[in-house]
């Protein structure tokens, strides 16, 4: 039995997979911030997790996926205000009783040190210093990501 959050995540991911392939992104569009091989868009409004997921999809992107602790730290370094929380693309899968990224993979327990409970309707947010489990209905900001296509001798936009 999948929760409504899980269904929403699966539906959006499937619809993204059906869309026509676009040419690779060589540098970040205006208003997006480059972090290594990704372009990030930090929202300036707030939404529950599933609305944030949908918003990223309309922007032909996804909620942020964090590969490892190093990427987490680099992302957190971009957050100026200690008090602001941002949704990322990780929520609790009730059926698998585990944290699951929106791309279908499970969280490696060593990657993130999550503060809070792993339970139904829990989604993950990050702040400048920490990673939190929050009710998915909580209205906070979010981070969308686009992957850059690696090219040699790339000129990076302003940082």
């Amino acid at each position: 039995q999948k929760s409504s959050i899980e269904k929403c995540s699966v539906d959006i991911q499937q619809s993204r997979n059906k869309t026509t392939e676009r040419p690779g992104l060589l540098n970040c569009p205006i208003y997006w911030q480059q972090l290594r091989e990704k372009c990030l868009l930090f929202s300036h409004t707030v939404n529950p997790w599933n609305n944030s997921l949908a918003d990223c999809s309309t922007k032909e992107s996804s909620l942020l996926l964090i590969r490892d602790k190093d990427e987490l730290i680099h992302t957190q370094n971009l957050i100026r205000d200690k008090a602001i929380l941002f949704w990322i693309g990780l929520n609790f899968s009730l059926s698998e009783k585990n944290w699951k990224w929106i791309n279908g993979s499970f969280l490696n327990s060593n990657d993130l040190e999550i503060r809070g409970d792993a339970k139904e309707n829990s989604c993950i947010s990050i702040s400048q210093t920490s990673v939190y489990s929050e009710y998915c209905s909580t209205e906070i900001r979010w981070i969308c990501q686009k992957e850059l296509t690696p090219v040699r001798n790339k000129v990076y936009p302003d940082s």
Partner: antibody
Framework: QVQLQESGPGLVKPSETLSLTCTVS????????WSWIRQPPGRGLEWIGY???????NYNPSLKSRVTISLDTSKNQFSLKLNSVTAADTAVYYC??????????WGQGTLVTVSS | DIVMTQTPLSSPVTLGQPASISCRSS???????????LSWLQQRPGQPPRLLIY???NRFSGVPDRFSGSGAGTDFTLKISRVEAEDVGVYYC????????FGQGTRLEIK
């Protein structure tokens, strides 16, 4: 209601640095993009650059080598520095809030004249 | 750079009559996020610009409904259904698909 107010010297000597500050009231600077735009007397508008609330910047390529925009969240201000100015930099300088391509709130503008 | 070209550069209009301003971009304004960041600004004499329309057709808060925007791709139009005396000024289109650029402006004046 968000309000923006530019401040800084109205006269700058050639080759010196133009420095302006924009103070934001009625809303927090810890959101959105914050832009500088200029308008030479009797002419059209030119975008100078923006700073995002997380501190990253993007500049007009034609001015990029001379421009720095910075942010002070504690004072709810953002600033423009344009170095090595010439008479061609004489303009009314505006600050504005940028909602991803929609400049929705503007300051009244401040005229900066470059002259010796 | 994306070049924005407005026509006409000057538009004398009779009060109560409609007015239309065209804006053409040198390339498509569809951003890689799927949105089209084309806005229209009004600058009355001696005042800063004021946002009228954003993302082609969305009226900004407080803007009278006689102002409307339309278009797609590279061709965009601002329409004023019935011109009023307070509409006098210069109108600019602006794109933000890449770094923002403005049209050269269209001066609206009363006949």
């Amino acid at each position: 209601q968000v309000q923006l107010q530019e401040s800084g010297p109205g006269l700058v000597k050639p080759s010196e640095t133009l420095s302006l500050t924009c103070t934001v009231s009625g809303g927090s600077i810890s959101s959105y993009y914050w832009s500088w735009i200029r308008q030479p007397p009797g002419r059209g508008l030119e975008w100078i650059g923006y700073i995002y609330y997380i501190g990253s910047t993007n500049y007009n390529p034609s001015l990029k080598s001379r421009v720095t925009i910075s942010l002070d969240t504690s004072k709810n201000q953002f600033s423009l520095k344009l170095n090595s100015v010439t008479a061609a930099d004489t303009a009314v300088y505006y600050c504005a809030r940028d909602m991803m391509g929609a400049l929705d709130y503007w300051g009244q503008g401040t005229l900066v004249t470059v002259s010796s | 750079d994306i070049v924005m070209t407005q026509t006409p550069l000057s538009s004398p209009v009779t009060l109560g009559q409609p007015a239309s301003i065209s804006c053409r971009s040198s390339e498509s304004l569809v951003h890689s996020d799927g949105n089209t960041y084309l806005s229209w600004l009004q600058q009355r004499p001696g005042q800063p610009p004021r946002l009228l329309i954003y993302k082609i057709s969305n009226r900004f808060s407080g803007v009278p409904d006689r102002f409307s925007g339309s278009g797609a791709g590279t061709d965009f139009t601002l329409k004023i259904s019935r011109v009023e005396a307070e509409d006098v000024g210069v109108y600019y289109c602006m794109q933000a698909a890449q770094f923002p650029t403005f049209g050269q402006g269209t001066r609206l004046e009363i006949k």
